[in-house]
Interface confidence: low
C-alpha cells in the first residue's frame, strides 16, 4: 500500500482556450482531473486501474499551483493504492475548463477538455521527485511526482506490511525494511509466542507471558521438571506422573509396605546381624554372649557350660574361670590326669583304655553326657526348636520360645498368615506351608492383589495431537500431556494461530 | 443535447459483414469515446469493445477480437462498428454508448439497430 | 472475467412498494466501478446509477444504489408505473467490462 504523489507546479494557456480551439469566455477556469493505470506501451483509454482524483478550480487560463500540503489541502495530489507497487504506470492528465461550480463530468459542456497529457514509465518508490514538463500546440503544464508508502508499509514495493502491536496478535515494533522485531520476552514468526522462564521443561512447562512457568498437569517444581507421584504414594517417586515407583525396602501400590525392617528399624541389639525375612519380618543372629529374638539379652559366659569334666565356671569381668575337679586341668579342664583306675566316670558311664592306660573314655547311659558322664544331656542342643524359635530348659523339660508368626511345641506352626488379611483390593488368602498366597478380584494382581489391571483408561488412545496419555490410578481417569500449541482435555484444539498476513 | 443516432437495420446473410454506424452530436467528440455493447432477442447486454475519439486506441472483447473492427471520423464526428463473418446468432440491436475518459459508464446511448443474419 | 448474477430474476410488485434488485460479482468490484441502467421494452437503456450510489442527472431521488466488494443493491422506494422495466447492473473495472443477466420487475 503507498501513494503515487503529484504535485501539479504551473499549467500555461496563454491564449485561453479549449482543445476544440474555441476561447473560454471570460477565461478558462481550470481544473485537473487525474488518471492512473497500469503500464500500457500505448495509453489508452479504460479503467484508472490504480485510481482517480480531480482538483478544484486551481486558477485561470496560466498560473502557478500553490503547494498546500502544509495546510492539509490538495496539492500535492494524492493517489493512493492498496497493492504492491508494480514499478510502472501510466499517467494521464486532463486540465478541464469550468463554466461554472458544478465539476462532475456530466455536469460539465461536451467540449470542456481544454488539454490532455499521457505519460508511462518506471517508477521506484522514494522519496525524491521526478520533475516533468508536458507542452502542447496551445498549453504547457509543469508538475513533478512520486511514489511513498503509506504508514506501516515497508520494501521496495510497499508490499511489506508491519505495524507494531503489543497484543494477543502479537508483541514487536518495526524495522526499517519493514522486518518484525519482537518486543523483549517475545519469540516467534509474528512474536506471539513468549519466551518462558529459563530453564522452564519444553514439553512439561509452557508459559502465556515471558518468563513464567506454568506446569502441564502432572508436573511441578518451579522449571516443571519434577513429576507429580500417585497420590498416597509413601516411599516411592516417580519418572513420569502418577507414577509410585518404590524406594528400596518398600513395596505395595502406594510403597508403603516395609520390605526392609532390618534397615528402616534396626532391631537387632548388641551388634547382631539382621536378615529381612519378609513384610516387617526379621531374625536376628546374636554374637556370642547374647540371646533373645532382637539379641538383647545379655548370656553368663557360664551359660554356655565351657567347662568340661566336672569343672565348675566362675563368671569373671573379662571373660570366665574354669575351677578344675582333681584330675583334670586346662583352660576347660579338658586335660586329664586320670586313668581308667582312678573310676572316673560318673553316672553308671563305663571306663575304657585308651592309648595303653594313658587316657580314657567314658561310655555314658542314655541322659548323661560329657567326658566324665557328669552332664545331664542338654534337651536343647539338638536345636529342636524349627523357625528360629529359641530352646529353653526348664528343669526336667525344654520349651521352645517362639519368634512372631510361629507357634506349636517346637514353633513348627504358622500362625495364619491370612489373619493379617494382607489381600488387597478384596482378594481371598490362602496358607501355604512357608507363606501365604493371594487370590485377586478380577482387575487386581500382584502377590498382594496390589497392582490394578483392568482399568487402563489410556487403552482408548483418548488424547489427540500426539498428546502423552497418563492414568490416574486413583480416580481410573486418563490425563492428556499436550505438545506445544494445543490444549483441551484431550488437546483438541490448537492455540490460535496468527492471522494471515498479506505478504 | 448530447445525442448519439445509429444507422438503420440490417438484413444479412450468414458469413457476410455489417458496418453500424453511431453520430454523435451536442459534446466534443474528440475528449470521449464510444462503446458498442449488443443485444440478442429477449437477452441481456452483451459488451462487444470501445474506441477512443482522442487517439482511435481501441479494446475488443475477446469473444470478437478476430472479426471486429471499430473506427471513428473525427471531421465527421461519427464511430463505425464493422462485424464480419456473420453467423445467425449474431442476429441482435447493436447499440452505440458515448463513455468519459476517467468515467466509465455508458451514457447516453445510441437508440440501437437491429441487424438480421438469416439466409 | 468478472461474472455478474442478479437476483431475482424476475420481481413482481405493485405500484407504491419498495423494491430491491441485488447484484452479486464473483470476485471484488470498485464501487467507483459500478453502475445500474434500466431498459423499457423497445428502447435503449438509460443509465440510473453510478459509481454504485451517485444518481445520474435527471434519475429522481426514489432510486438508490448501494453496496461495495462483491455485493450491491439498487433499492426502488416506492415503484412507480414507469419504473416497471428491466434492470441491469454493470462493472467497468476490469476489462472484458461486463453486465449482469438483468431484472424485470413486473406489475403484480
Known amino acids: 500500500s503507498g501513494v503515487f504523489q503529484l504535485q501539479l507546479q504551473e499549467f500555461i494557456n496563454e491564449r485561453g482556450v479549449l482543445a476544440s480551439g474555441r476561447p473560454c469566455e471570460p477565461g478558462c477556469r481550470t481544473f485537473f482531473r487525474v488518471c492512473l493505470k497500469h503500464f500500457q506501451a500505448v495509453v489508452s483509454p479504460g479503467p484508472c486501474t490504480f485510481g482517480t482524483v480531480s482538483t478544484p478550480v486551481l486558477g485561470t487560463n496560466s498560473f502557478a499551483v500553490r503547494d498546500d500540503s502544509s495546510g492539509g489541502g490538495r496539492n500535492p495530489l494524492q493517489l493512493p493504492f492498496n497493492f504492491t507497487w508494480p514499478g510502472t504506470f501510466s499517467l494521464i492528465i486532463e486540465a478541464w475548463h469550468a463554466p461554472g461550480d458544478d465539476l462532475r463530468p456530466e455536469a460539465l459542456p461536451p467540449d470542456a477538455l481544454i488539454s490532455k497529457i499521457a505519460i508511462q514509465g518506471s517508477l521506484a518508490v522514494g522519496q525524491n521527485w521526478l520533475l516533468d514538463e508536458q507542452t502542447s500546440t496551445l498549453t504547457r503544464l509543469r508538475y513533478s511526482y512520486r511514489v511513498i508508502c503509506s504508514d506501516n508499509y515497508y520494501g521496495d514495493n510497499c508490499s511489506r506490511l508491519c505495524k507494531k502491536r503489543n497484543d494477543h496478535f502479537g508483541h514487536y515494533v518495526c524495522q526499517p525494511d519493514g522486518n518484525l522485531s519482537c518486543l523483549p520476552g517475545w519469540t516467534g514468526e509474528y512474536c506471539q509466542q513468549p519466551i518462558c522462564l529459563s530453564g522452564c521443561h519444553e514439553q512439561n512447562g509452557y508459559c502465556s507471558k515471558p518468563a513464567e512457568c506454568l506446569c502441564r498437569p502432572g508436573w511441578q517444581g518451579r522449571l516443571c521438571n519434577e513429576c507429580i507421584p500417585h497420590n498416597g504414594c509413601r516411599h516411592g517417586t516417580c519418572s513420569t506422573p502418577w507414577q509410585c515407583t518404590c524406594d528400596e525396602g518398600w513395596g505395595g501400590l502406594f510403597c508403603d509396605q516395609d520390605l526392609n525392617y532390618c534397615t528402616h528399624h534396626s532391631p537387632c541389639k548388641n551388634g547382631a546381624t539382621c536378615s529381612n525375612s519378609g513384610q516387617r519380618s526379621y531374625t536376628c543372629t546374636c554374637r556370642p554372649g547374647y540371646t533373645g529374638v532382637d539379641c538383647e539379652l545379655e548370656l553368663s559366659e557360664c551359660d554356655s557350660n565351657p567347662c568340661r569334666n566336672g569343672g565348675s565356671c566362675k563368671d569373671q569381668e573379662d571373660g570366665y574361670h574354669c575351677l578344675c575337679p582333681p584330675g583334670y586341668y586346662g583352660l576347660h579342664c579338658e586335660h586329664s590326669t586320670l586313668s581308667c583306675a582312678d573310676s572316673p566316670c560318673f553316672n553308671g558311664g563305663s571306663c575304657r583304655e585308651r592309648n595303653q592306660g594313658a587316657n580314657y573314655a567314658c561310655e555314658c547311659p542314655p541322659n548323661f553326657t560329657g567326658s566324665n558322664c557328669e552332664k545331664k544331656v542338654d534337651r536343647c542342643t539338638s536345636n529342636p526348636c524349627a523357625n528360629g524359635g529359641q530352646c529353653l530348659n526348664r528343669g526336667p523339660s525344654r520349651m521352645c520360645r517362639c519368634r512372631p508368626g510361629f507357634t506349636g511345641t517346637y514353633c513348627e506352626l504358622h500362625v495364619s498368615d491370612c489373619a493379617r488379611n494382607p489381600c488387597a483390593h478384596g482378594g481371598t488368602c490362602h496358607d501355604l506351608e512357608n507363606g501365604l498366597m493371594c487370590t485377586c478380584p478380577a482387575g487386581f494382581s500382584g502377590r498382594r492383589c496390589e497392582v490394578r489391571t483392568s482399568i487402563d483408561a489410556c487403552a482408548s488412545s483418548p488424547c489427540f495431537n500426539r498428546a502423552t496419555c497418563y492414568t490416574d490410578l486413583s480416580t481410573d481417569t486418563f490425563v492428556c500431556n499436550c505438545p506445544y500449541g494445543f490444549v483441551g482435555s484431550r488437546c483438541e484444539f490448537p492455540v490460535g494461530l496468527p492471522p494471515s498476513f498479506p505478504w | 443535447q448530447v445525442q448519439l443516432v445509429q444507422s438503420g437495420a440490417e438484413v444479412k446473410k450468414p458469413g457476410a459483414s455489417v458496418k453500424v454506424s453511431c453520430k454523435a452530436s451536442?459534446?466534443?467528440?474528440?475528449?470521449?469515446?464510444i462503446s458498442w455493447v449488443r443485444q440478442a432477442p429477449g437477452q441481456g447486454l452483451e459488451w462487444m469493445g470501445w474506441i477512443s475519439a482522442y487517439d482511435n486506441n481501441a479494446d475488443y472483447a475477446q469473444n470478437f477480437q478476430a472479426r471486429v473492427t471499430m473506427t471513428t471520423d473525427t471531421s465527421t464526428t461519427t464511430a463505425y462498428m464493422e462485424l464480419r463473418s456473420l453467423r445467425s446468432d449474431d442476429t441482435a440491436v447493436y447499440y452505440c454508448?458515448?463513455?468519459?475518459?476517467?468515467?466509465?459508464?455508458?451514457?447516453?446511448w445510441g437508440q440501437g439497430t437491429l441487424v438480421t443474419v438469416s439466409s | 472475467e468478472i461474472v455478474l448474477t442478479q437476483s431475482p430474476g424476475t420481481l413482481s410488485l405493485s405500484p407504491g412498494e419498495r423494491a430491491t434488485l441485488s447484484c452479486r460479482a464473483s470476485?471484488?468490484?470498485?464501487?467507483?466501478?459500478l453502475a445500474w441502467y434500466q431498459q423499457q421494452p423497445g428502447q435503449a437503456p438509460r443509465l440510473l446509477i453510478y459509481?454504485?450510489?451517485s444518481r445520474a442527472t435527471g434519475i429522481p431521488d426514489r432510486f438508490s444504489g448501494s453496496g461495495s466488494g462483491t455485493d450491491f443493491t439498487l433499492t426502488i422506494s416506492r415503484l412507480e408505473p414507469e419504473d416497471f422495466a428491466v434492470y441491469y447492473c454493470?462493472?467497468?473495472?476490469?476489462?472484458?467490462?461486463?453486465f449482469g443477466q438483468g431484472t424485470k420487475v413486473e406489475i403484480k
Open positions: 470476485q471484488s468490484v470498485s464501487s467507483t466501478y
Open positions: 459509481g454504485a450510489s
Open positions: 454508448a458515448r463513455y468519459s475518459w476517467n468515467f466509465h459508464w455508458f451514457d447516453p
Open positions: 451536442g459534446y466534443t467528440f474528440s475528449t470521449y469515446g
Open positions: 454493470q462493472q467497468y473495472g476490469n476489462s472484458p467490462w461486463t
